[in-house]
């Protein structure tokens, strides 16, 4: 019996009767063996086929075979009913070896042929299985040559059989206070072969309850307790199970925080599985209840464990916890069934009493002390001497707990000393030097340094003064005594005040003229304005109507008098106004140098002579009177003149202040 | 976490101001509660001196209000105390705290003398 | 002013004793009371707000009971650093005011 080729050799060939493509010979036995690589198969077809018919071919034939299997048993030219030809058939073996019999009997009635055949190896396609047939691979078959082999969808892996797929179903653990687990695939049979568990892990204090859903199928056997696969559920108190068959399992209250859910299959079947919805429980916390002018949110039928509420109070209500505010409130449900934090009150917003005011006071219009939401109180300044900055004054306690202005200022008002108050009535002439009466000059300021200077009160805080007259203390403002509300010098009834900063104006040059010599002094305190202490107004942008030539301003102080000494009582001097040329041609000869009067001085006295200031009324206010608004302002600021004070034909040299106004509010609200 | 730190000169003249700032870290002091300034004389017991509220309003003992002012500056989460004409009385360790006194700074210590 | 007056003053106990220590508040404070314990050189550490509330990582032997007027802090089994002092305080009206204190030292 000649063997066909055998791998690793190359399996092709031809194969055919003896003696063809002559007649065949009786009694002729002839046996092949092909065989092929693991992983082929051999193809077999025929190109000649002229063989003896008989029936069921029992008289001469070829016979295929694949191991034990039977292929086909061939004779004849063409098939009948109940013999076969090969005709165009091309035949497979089962396997990787192909059996080939020819045998011929004693006798044949006439001559035939025989057959030729043609063979070759080719590769088996074990993903191609036929209808009816377990699939090859449970999930993905890759067919390569000589063999093939498996792979696994997501969340799977390649069983050590090489064909199944076994779910990757461990290690899942559900932390929500309810959820859904399923068998793998559900509501599609389950993957066989495999061990799942998943874990429901709560907070302690939560219980587990599992509710088996929709439907439950799992392989069962009809005497045995759940042989195949099965599903169990353990908790640190018992275990359920194992379930399988297809009626739902009951409710399952684990009064555990923590379950571990095994389901195990085998090899076979086809079953749905099942689907448990778990949700867990645990003990309630006392209902809140709702403080007074407060609400719970959210409204919940009960609370349970890391179930939480917040209060929220009324429009003009706060939380409190006693005298402790809170701008929010959250409780937590333990797990022993309390709240974590007790419940806070919503007490009416409460703004307390207002701030004092300085030179104000305050009235209750609500009702006596009412201080709490919406109540309202009215500030007002102390009347003659002070006015109201800004607002109205009326204030009303808000639900932020802040006293609110009706522009939503949270801030005080502010009561501004009303200036350019005298008890004086100008009269329109001109006359000597004369003694000052209390409330004439309440701006008057009386400076003790070095030297005796003079200055005028601005605002309750500040006080101006001539750059000159304060030069020497601008690096020691302390050194300044400062002394208003007298009219004696030398009188020790006066208000105190004293020097916190000096600011020189930065274009004053000290010893080369008296360009710029102006200078302002902060208080370190504020002062009590009164009929004695008032300060003077900076002027308008109209203010220069009023001090054109030959008007009047009136010029004070405790400087030399004729007889040559510092006057003990404040003298005054109205004097006009100087036109600026005249003034300018009076000091160009000399001894005083060119350009000695600039733009930013103004000048006051007679032609004549004999009303002037003079050494020691320094910095001091010259004054005019306002008749618009019925209030003084300083002009000038005593600057300097003539080495002889009052002398004919020379003038009393005085800062003109109105140059200066965006220098003095610039160093007030910087300072 | 939160942390409270004081921070302030540890001597003071008498007649003067005491300035003490307190810094908070790992809360913002206008998020909620109030946030207190507390004060132990050494080896005595505590005394309260007041609040400011995450609002910025404040509440002050009685018996210190007409010396104390407490402020803040919510851009560097810090609030503070001023405590004027000071004498030997005031001399104790100061401690800052949030809300009752859930969270305290390590407290400094001022000593006032000339 | 609402005074808070704590007894004792001071007491001597070992470890393992259970210990309790009250305060009187001289008007209704509610419960708007807290329990600190205070070590020398160190800062008050909050142990029981709202008579009853032990704070976090506040050991479960520290409780704390009472309303209105009359409060209690119970240390149930005395540990080696418990000895300290402790101070009531009531946070219900201004101005918020503490007890003076117990000393609790080793017997």
């Known amino acids: 019996t000649p063997l066909g080729p055998k791998w690793p050799e190359p399996v092709f060939g031809r194969l055919a009767s003896p003696g063809f493509p002559g007649e065949y010979a009786n009694d002729q036995e002839r046996r092949w063996t092909l065989t092929a690589p693991p992983g082929y198969r051999l193809r077999l077809y025929f190109t000649h086929f002229d063989l003896e018919l008989s029936h069921l071919c029992e008289y001469d034939f070829v016979k295929l075979s694949s191991g034990a299997k039977v292929l086909a048993t061939l004779c004849g030219q063409e098939s009948t009913d109940t013999e076969r030809a090969p005709g165009k058939d091309t035949f497979y073996s089962l396997g990787s070896s192909l059996d080939i019999t020819f045998r011929s009997d004693y006798s044949n009635e006439k001559p035939f042929t025989g057959f030729e055949a043609f063979y070759a190896a080719e590769d088996i396609d074990e993903c191609q299985v036929a209808p009816g047939e377990a699939p090859t691979c449970d999930h993905h078959c890759h067919n390569h040559l000589g063999g093939f082999y498996c792979s696994c969808r997501a969340g799977y892996v390649l069983h050590r059989n090489k064909r199944t797929c076994s779910a990757l179903c461990s290690g899942q653990v559900f932390t929500q206070r309810s959820g859904e687990l399923s068998s793998p695939e559900y509501p599609r049979p389950y993957p066989k072969l495999s061990s799942c568990t998943y874990s429901i892990s709560l907070e302690e204090g939560f219980s587990v309850i599992l509710d088996f859903v929709e439907s439950f199928d799992v392989e069962t056997h009809p005497e045995t307790l759940c042989p195949y696969d099965f599903l169990k559920i353990q908790t640190d108190r018992e275990e359920h199970g194992p379930f399988c068959g297809k009626t739902l399992p009951h409710r399952i209250e684990t009064k555990s925080n923590t379950v571990t859910i095994t389901f195990v299959t085998d090899e076979s079947g086809d079953h749905t599985g099942w689907k448990i919805h778990y949700t867990s429980t645990a003990q309630p916390c006392p209902y809140p209840m709702a403080p007074p002018n407060g609400h719970v949110s959210p409204v919940q039928a009960k609370y349970i464990l890391k179930d939480s509420f917040s209060i929220f109070c009324e429009t003009g209500y706060e939380l409190l916890q006693g005298h402790l505010p809170l701008k929010s409130f959250t409780a937590v449900c333990q797990k022993d069934g309390s709240w974590d934090r007790p419940m806070p009150a919503c007490s009416i917003v409460d703004c307390g009493p207002p701030d004092d005011l300085p030179s104000g006071r305050v009235e209750y219009i609500t009702g006596p002390g009412v201080t709490t939401y919406k109540a309202v109180i009215q500030y007002s300044c102390e009347e003659t001497f002070y006015t109201m900055k800004v607002n109205d004054g009326k204030y009303v306690c808000e639900a932020d707990g802040f006293w609110t202005s009706s522009k939503g200022e949270k801030s005080l008002p502010v009561c501004e000393p009303v200036c350019g108050l005298s008890a004086r009535t100008t009269g329109g002439r001109i006359y000597g030097g004369q003694k000052a009466k209390p409330g004439d000059f309440p701006w008057q300021v009386l400076i003790l340094g070095g030297t005796t200077a003079a200055g005028a009160l601005l605002y309750d805080n500040w006080v101006l003064t001539a750059a000159h007259a304060v030069y020497e203390q601008k690096h020691d403002a302390s050194a300044l005594d400062i002394r208003m509300g007298t009219l004696k010098r030398l009188s020790p009834h006066y208000t105190q005040a004293w020097s916190e900063a000096v600011f020189i104006h930065e274009g004053y040059t000290h010893d080369a003229g008296f360009d710029n010599d102006i200078a302002l002094i902060k208080l370190n305190n504020k002062v009590v304005i009164n009929s004695n202490i008032t300060p003077i107004c900076l002027p308008r942008k109209e203010a220069e109507s009023f001090m054109r030539t030959d008007d009047i301003g009136t010029a004070s102080g405790w400087g030399l008098t004729q007889r040559g000494f510092l006057a003990r009582n404040l003298m005054y001097v109205d004097i006009p106004i100087v036109d600026h040329q005249k003034c300018t041609a009076a000091y160009e000869k000399p001894p005083y140098p060119r350009g000695s009067v600039t733009a930013n001085m103004l000048c006051a006295g007679l032609e004549s002579g004999g009303k002037d200031s003079c050494r020691g009324d320094s910095g001091g206010a010259l004054v005019f009177l306002d008749s618009e608004t019925e209030r003084w302002f300083v002009g000038g600021i005593v600057s300097w003149g003539s080495m002889n004070c009052g002398e004919a034909g020379q003038y009393g040299v005085y800062t003109k202040v109105i140059n200066y106004i965006p220098w003095i509010e610039n160093i007030i609200s910087d300072f | 976490q939160l942390q409270l730190q004081e921070s302030g000169p540890g001597l003071v003249k008498p007649s003067e101001t005491l300035s003490l700032t307190c810094t908070v870290s790992g809360y913002s002091i206008t998020s909620d509660y109030a946030w207190n300034w507390i004060r132990q004389p050494p080896g005595k017991g505590l005394e309260w001196i007041g609040y400011i509220s995450y609002s910025g309003r404040t509440s002050y003992n009685p018996s210190l209000k007409s010396r104390v002012t407490i402020s803040r500056d919510t851009s560097k989460n810090q609030f503070s105390l001023k405590l004027s004409s000071v004498t030997a009385a005031d001399t104790a360790v100061y401690y800052c705290?949030?809300?009752?006194?859930?969270?305290w700074g390590q407290g400094t210590l001022v000593t006032v003398s000339s | 002013d609402i005074q808070m007056t704590q007894s004792p003053s001071s007491l001597s106990a070992s470890v393992g004793d259970r210990v309790t220590i009250t305060c009187r508040a001289s008007?209704?404070?509610?419960?708007?009371v807290a329990w600190y314990q205070q070590k020398p050189g160190k800062a008050p550490k909050a142990l029981i707000y709202s008579a009853s509330y032990r704070e976090s990582g506040v050991p479960s032997r520290f409780s704390g009971s009472g309303s209105g007027t009359d409060f209690t802090l119970t240390i149930s089994s005395l540990q080696p650093e418990d000895f300290a002092t402790y101070f009531c305080q009531q946070f219900n009206t201004n101005p918020l005011t503490f007890g003076g204190g117990t000393k609790v030292e080793i017997k």
């Open positions: 008007q209704n404070v509610g419960t708007n």
């Open positions: 705290a949030r809300h009752y006194g859930d969270y």
